[in-house]
């Protein structure tokens, strides 16, 4: 029942939660929109001015088992002339996203949620320069 | 499915994919790692396809706040400061998995719920559809 | 034994300031967001203010806005509110409640609830 309601009985538990051991949550991995798809520009990542390359970390105990990392293929940008300018730098952009870990002790089987962090792409960025006095 | 060995002695010496329900411990690994893109880097001022950071918040979600990226220009910054519309700034996008209460009521009972955001942006040539 | 205990309530003049804790033993607040809750004579249970366990956002109910503010310390595995500008409506018993990972606008998601504390506003 939501907040606010009339003569609700606060620390009942409604029958219809599921039983969960101390210490634990119960965690259904069907995930909601999961048809959902990015809808990125496309070829965007050799077309960038840092383009990168993508590649799939595979784990059989982390679910999703395929995670998609980016790699910057070059230190500077890509000039209009193609060619690498090293006076700007390309540079990785992260993002965290959670997983499910599944750990093996013995014969028993426990899951840890897990956060990590995904390469998604690079961007052209003007250095930082440090002047030593 | 993918099957993994397992320690021969163990009564059910495979495990298949994974269940549709999983009972997880609560200490999350790697919680701690700093979240606020703003603080980690500067990269969103420093870029030539510069971006501002958007706080999307959901108290019933974990994380319960998270960063949106929207491109500041059509064009990209050239050498002189100034936009170069024959480049485009385009946000790189990406799936992320977080946690939503379901059902809403209970309290120890979670769901994966994949959400799309912008996360940066980056230059990129434009493609130049060409008119017969 | 696993509790929260909600300190910090008593008598004040409309206008004055006061800072409720609550402290939880039994249990860690590391994973749980933290809601206060309050409840006037003859009235419903309203949440007026959550503070998350990712990242510690507020959130405020709309009466309390710009002059409550909650706050987390995970170290001494203590919630705060402190209250401004107390105004005679504010009076009600203050209850604190921790919920599982995110906050919720539903009573029962809420796993564990102190005792309360009596916080009365009257010139």
């Known amino acids: 029942r939501k907040i606010p309601k009339v003569g609700h009985t606060f620390f009942q538990k409604p029958e219809s939660c599921p039983p969960v051991p101390g210490g634990s949550m119960k965690l259904d991995i069907g995930i909601i929109n999961e048809n959902q798809r990015v809808s990125m520009s496309r070829n965007i990542e050799s077309r960038s001015t840092s383009p990168w390359n993508y590649t799939v970390t595979w784990d059989p105990n982390r679910y999703p088992s395929e995670v998609v990392q980016a790699q910057c293929r070059n230190l500077g940008c890509i000039n209009a002339q193609g060619k690498e300018d090293i006076s700007m730098n390309s540079v990785p952009i992260q993002q965290e996203t959670l997983v499910v870990r599944r750990k093996h002790q013995g014969c028993s089987v426990s899951f840890q949620l897990e956060k990590v962090l995904v390469t998604v792409g690079c961007t052209c960025v003007t250095p930082v320069i440090h002047h030593v006095q | 499915g993918i099957t993994i060995p397992r320690n021969p002695g163990c009564p059910n010496s495979e495990d298949k994919n994974f269940p549709r329900t999983v009972m997880v411990n609560l200490n999350i690994h790697n919680r701690n790692t700093n979240t606020n893109p703003k603080r980690s880097s500067d990269y969103y001022n420093r870029s030539t396809s510069p971006w501002n950071l958007h706080r999307n918040e959901d108290p019933e979600r974990y994380p319960s706040v998270i960063w949106e990226a929207k491109c500041r220009h059509l064009g990209c910054i050239n050498a002189d400061g100034n936009v170069d519309y024959h480049m485009n700034s385009v946000p790189i996008q990406q799936e992320i998995l977080v946690l939503r209460r379901e059902p809403p009521h209970c309290p120890n009972s979670f769901r994966l719920e994949k959400i799309l955001v912008s996360v940066g942006c980056t230059c990129v040539t434009p493609i130049v559809h060409h008119v017969a | 034994e696993v509790q929260l205990v909600e300190s910090g309530g008593g008598l004040v003049q409309p206008g004055e300031s006061l800072r409720l804790s609550c402290k939880a033993s039994?249990?860690?607040?590391?994973?749980?967001?933290l809601g206060w809750f309050r409840q006037a004579p003859g009235k419903e249970r309203e949440g007026i203010s959550c503070?998350?366990?990712?990242?510690?956002?507020?959130y405020y109910t709309d009466s309390v806005k710009g002059r409550f503010t909650i706050s987390r310390d995970n170290s001494k595995n203590t919630v705060y509110l402190q209250m401004n500008s107390l105004k005679t409506e504010d009076t009600a018993i203050y209850y604190c409640?921790?919920?599982?990972?995110?906050?919720?606008?539903?009573?029962?998601?809420?796993?564990?609830w102190g005792q309360g504390t009596q916080v009365t506003v009257s010139s």
């Open positions: 409640a921790a919920a599982l990972l995110t906050c919720s606008s539903y009573y029962d998601a809420y796993t564990y």
């Open positions: 039994g249990f860690s607040l590391d994973y749980y967001a």
């Open positions: 503070i998350t366990s990712s990242d510690a956002s507020a």
